[in-house]
């Protein structure tokens, strides 16, 4: 299936040009999306091109500037947040990145009623997290690992927690491992729907081993970065959840929410918190051995001033074939009765589907079914449930938005997006206003992305929010590669692949092949999305064929494929890449003497193992920031898929699945190993150990480190990285410079 046909006609060929590496590094062909910042059922805010903050009313068609670019510029603001009562705006400046989601910033409060910044009781700096209450203009913020509350922006703060300590106790913000591997947020505090209560997590990292690495900087002596980072099998953070009444917080103080007994009996994690009403909250917990999850619904008992979590409101989710959930355990979406909820989990056939839970999980009513997966529940209203799935035309790498009418019986299902712009748009996400009165659809491809606004009742398109016209025009004289998404059937396994082909691809010719791999559990690389990136350039200008393959362990095709890698990472992911390469060779247009593989992070691990597989298939390959042993990676992630590195659990496979154990097998391939020295995520230690093993085995290899760079290798390092990798591949494939 040709998803992005080349627009080359013979008459135009001489005016067309190939992509250059410079195009990619400069972001010449990047696209824009439009996500409305909803502030009511029919209003949203958006930052205009000239940086004014504009309020749009869909129903009146009117718009007005609520905050001028002049005000933004006066404090160098890069972000903003309007208080729900619309009286104040916080302005964020001095952004300073920490880890993947976390950053610190300076915050200024602007009073819209008098057009002045709030003076007196200003916020301290830098702040780790700040947010408005959902109603009114209370502020909660985290400063130096403690939580503070302001009843009004001009009021003095009330300190809620006092035990916060750098790298020891984290209140209202996650520690490293919870941020990266569990919550995927920079915050760990949650307002109740009307702002009566504030829930927060406390993470105690006192006993966690610390990863230490040098940050070279410009000084005479390097700094040492210390991060409490639990590797597989190590001591984990101790988490507690508290709730405080924000009306009179000094009276009762923070109240701890009890952990379900079956969870508290051994090491456990807190996985998410969902407010249902102001006096009902839902917490999700997970055993350290991550195949048992408990959803606990707790109620505020006014007479006792406490949170009660009855056993009758505990719902257990257990996996017998793998770990609980997909990448994370799904979160519930509560219905209007404030007790029943919708949740995605595996059905009896092993496909993740929406279920309706009214009393017990055992009595759950299955809402969607089929040999495809429901992926996200966007919104539940009184009569509709909006969700995304990959059902349409049986392509797992697509995302369409569906509406199920839950107000009628039997419920009827409608695909909202399937036929809107069928060739251009097959991968959608959505953003809903209050009560789903309106919604925005953001299409990511395979054609040029487009964002549109729709009526939540009729699904009618109201207007185009962003169609990337400039990008479309810029691409008119570019020879883009062709893209195909197809599948291979091998030994009862379906391997979906995306192939990126040179513009003048000719099946009778032979092309060098580059496999781009990620392959991590519950990931998906073969997606119907638009991208003009490095591999687009390699196909367009350098005439390579690039393939991405989703093998065992990848997501959205059922539990059989997903959980195949459970407790044995590094085996089937590699096998399936190799199997696919063999199939590609059989297609007749691959030069089997010029095959390479590359990957980043988990992909670096897989590419390293593929190169060291001893198949003789690969001439060369690149591993960027690879994991080299699962004993070196984070407990939460690693143990989810591998269990514990103990003799009585899975130590043997931990040892067998290292890159170092295969050092000898790198002798007959060209290997380029790349890592940032300040990688907080996949520590430089991983590559250091690969290098040591290769040296000890007297195996030649190439390497590049990026001083003071993290897992993302950003900024100028990006340019250097892709230039360096391009040279390496061109040399490997004997392509002239």
């Amino acid at each position: 299936i040709v998803l992005r046909p080349s627009r080359v006609h013979n008459s135009e060929e001489n005016t067309m040009r190939a992509l250059t590496l410079k195009d990619i590094l400069n972001g010449t062909f990047s696209y824009k999306t439009f996500f409305p910042n909803w502030i009511s059922g029919q209003e949203y805010l958006h930052q205009s091109a000239d940086n004014n903050i504009v309020l749009y009313n869909i129903e009146t068609g009117q718009s007005y500037t609520i905050l001028s670019n002049r005000t933004m510029k006066s404090v160098n603001a890069s972000n903003y947040g309007l208080s729900p009562d619309r009286q104040f705006v916080y302005l964020e400046s001095d952004y300073s990145k920490l880890w993947r989601y976390s950053y610190t910033a300076t915050y200024y409060i602007y009073d819209l009623s008098n057009g002045e910044f709030v003076r007196g009781n200003e916020l301290p700096r830098p702040i780790q997290y700040l947010c408005w209450s959902p109603v009114g203009s209370k502020l909660a913020y985290v400063y130096q690992n403690n939580i503070y509350l302001k009843q009004r922006p001009g009021d003095p703060p009330f300190q809620i927690t006092f035990n916060g300590r750098e790298n020891k106790i984290f209140n209202g913000i996650p520690d490293w491992v919870y941020e990266e591997e569990m919550l995927a947020t920079k915050y760990a505090l949650w307002w109740s729907p009307n702002g009566k209560f504030l829930a927060y997590a406390e993470f105690n990292d006192t006993d966690i081993p610390v990863i230490a690495y040098s940050y070279y900087g410009d000084e005479q002596y390097p700094r040492t970065i210390n991060i409490p980072y639990p590797k597989a099998g190590a001591k984990n953070p101790v988490v507690r959840i508290f709730i405080i009444d924000t009306t009179y917080p000094a009276y009762v103080g923070p109240q701890e929410v009890p952990v379900p007994a079956m969870i508290a009996s051994s090491d456990y994690y807190f996985s998410w918190l969902t407010w249902v009403t102001d006096e009902r909250v839902c917490l999700q917990w997970l055993k350290r051995v991550q195949n048992v999850s408990v959803l606990s619904i707790c109620d505020f008992r006014e007479d006792w001033q406490t949170w009660d979590c009855p056993k009758t409101q505990e719902h257990i989710e257990e996996s017998r074939t793998g770990w609980a959930g997909g990448f994370f355990v799904s979160t519930p979406v509560f219905s209007y009765d404030a007790i029943s909820y919708y949740k995605i989990f595996s059905d009896k056939d092993g496909y993740k589907h929406i279920h309706y839970i009214k009393d017990t999980v055992e009595n759950a009513i299955q809402i969607t079914s089929g040999k495809w997966e429901a992926i996200n529940i966007f919104r539940v209203t009184q009569d509709s449930l909006f969700y995304s799935s990959n059902e349409f035309e049986e392509y797992p790498g697509r995302r369409n938005i569906y509406r199920i009418s839950i107000g009628s019986y039997p419920p009827s299902k409608k695909c909202v997006t399937c036929h809107l712009r069928k060739e251009r748009c097959q991968y959608y996400t959505a953003s809903f206003s209050d009560y789903a009165k309106y919604y925005a659809l953001v299409c990511y491809g395979p054609g040029i992305p487009i964002s549109t606004l729709h009526d939540g009742r009729t699904d009618q398109e109201i207007k185009i929010l962003e169609e990337n016209k400039e990008l479309e025009n810029a691409l008119k004289n570019i020879q883009l590669p062709k893209e195909e998404i197809k599948k291979l059937e091998v030994d009862e396994i379906t391997l979906w692949y995306k192939m990126i082909l040179p513009p003048q691809f000719d099946r009778s010719k032979k092309y060098p092949l580059l496999i781009q791999v990620y392959g991590g559990p519950c990931s998906q690389s073969v997606r119907s999305v638009f991208a003009v990136n490095w591999i687009s350039y390699l196909a367009s200008k350098e005439g390579m064929v690039i393939a991405l393959v989703d093998g065992r362990g990848t997501a959205f095709q059922g539990d059989k494929l997903l959980y195949a890698v459970y407790r044995k990472l590094g085996v089937y992911e590699v096998e399936d890449q190799i199997t696919a390469v063999r199939k590609f060779i059989e297609m007749g247009f691959i030069d089997e003497k010029r095959i390479a593989i590359w990957g980043w992070s988990y992909g670096g691990y897989v590419s390293s193992l593929a190169l060291a597989s001893g198949t003789g298939l690969f001439k060369c390959g690149i591993a960027v920031a690879p994991v080299s042993s699962w004993e070196y990676y984070a407990s939460v992630y690693t143990e989810r898929f591998m269990g514990l590195p103990t003799k009585d659990d899975n130590l043997e496979h931990y040892k067998n699945s290292t890159v170092m154990a295969r050092a000898e097998y790198f002798r007959n391939v060209d290997y380029l190993l790349i890592h940032g020295t300040a990688d907080d995520n996949v520590h430089f230690q991983n590559s250091a150990q690969i290098a040591k093993a290769l040296v000890n085995a007297q195996v030649d290899f190439q390497a590049m480190w990026y001083s003071d760079q993290n897992h993302g290798l950003s900024g100028l390092s990006t340019n250097h990285l892709y230039t360096h990798m391009t040279h390496f591949l061109k040399q490997c494939f004997s392509l002239s410079d």
Epitope: G120, N121, K150, Q151, R152, D155, P156, F158, Q159, F162, N163, R240, F242, T247, Y248, P249, A250, Y251, V252, G253, P254, Q255, E256, D303, W304, Q305, T306
Partner: antibody, heavy 117, light 108 residues
Framework: EVQLLESGGGLVQPGGSLRLSCAAS????????MSWVRQAPGKGLEWVSA????????YYADSVKGRFTISRDNSKNTLYLQMNSLRAEDTAVYYC??????????WGQGTLVTVSS | EIVLTQSPGTLSLSPGERATLSCRAS???????LAWYQQKPGQAPRLLIY???SRATGIPDRFSGSGSGTDFTLTISRLEPEDFAVYYC?????????FGQGTKVEIK
């Protein structure tokens, strides 16, 4: 009906120790933060210490930090104040009060601590 | 710490009269964290007002509180014989919580 009953006061020499107790009834003791507030003879009220619902959270006035220890036994519905290294200026009526940092909505009748040689 | 200064130190009034007691904070206090107490000789303090203006359970409506920032007021609209006592304001905004030195309302 909420009741707080302090005990354990008395005469003690400077440098000595005393342990005050406060027996609570009429409410779910384990769900509330509790405090000790004292009043020197003929003087005003001074907050001494508080303990949160979770026993790990304790707070002290600078004047008693390192000498006094607040604790609670939820199974016995009792609040304690262990007072060591007592000084003459610790002489006061000690009240047990329901609440964290305020408001304190219920108070005990108080127990007199006299530090004198 | 926040210092609360009450004035006047003593207020001499007759039953039936209006009493206005002032409490000034050394730094801003959010109204949620200000309370007033009444104490009679030989007795424990009793909570009258919390959140600067909310009456505690069982407190007659002749007692009212107001104010914000650094200035707070307790008003007794018509003094009853049982109202003659010492009144304290208290803040819970910052640790340590602090009390004013008290205002004594005595019979004239």
């Amino acid at each position: 009906e909420v009741q707080l009953l302090e005990s354990g006061g008395g005469l003690v020499q400077p440098g000595g120790s005393l342990r005050l107790s406060c027996a609570a009834s009429g409410f779910t003791f384990s769900s509330y933060a509790m405090s000790w507030v004292r009043q020197a003879p003929g003087k005003g009220l001074e907050w001494v210490s508080a303990i949160g619902v979770s026993t790990g959270s304790t707070y002290y006035a600078d004047s008693v930090k390192g000498r006094f220890t607040i604790s609670r036994d939820n199974s016995k519905n009792t609040l304690y104040l262990q007072m060591n290294s007592l000084r003459a200026e610790d002489t006061a009526v000690y009240y047990c009060a329901k609440g964290w940092l305020g408001p304190f909505d219920y108070w005990g009748q108080g127990t007199l601590v006299t530090v004198s040689s | 710490e926040i210092v609360l200064t009450q004035s006047p130190g003593t207020l001499s009034l007759s039953p039936g009269e209006r009493a206005t007691l002032s409490c000034r904070a050394s730094q801003s206090v959010s109204s949620s964290y200000l309370a007033w107490y009444q104490q009679k000789p030989g007795q424990a303090p009793r909570l009258l007002i919390y959140g600067a203006s909310s009456r505690a359970t069982g407190i007659p409506d002749r007692f009212s509180g107001s104010g914000s920032g650094t200035d707070f007021t307790l008003t007794i609209s018509r003094l009853e014989p049982e109202d003659f006592a010492v009144y304290y304001c208290q803040q819970g905004q910052l640790i340590p919580p602090t009390f004013g030195q008290g205002t004594k309302v005595e019979i004239k």
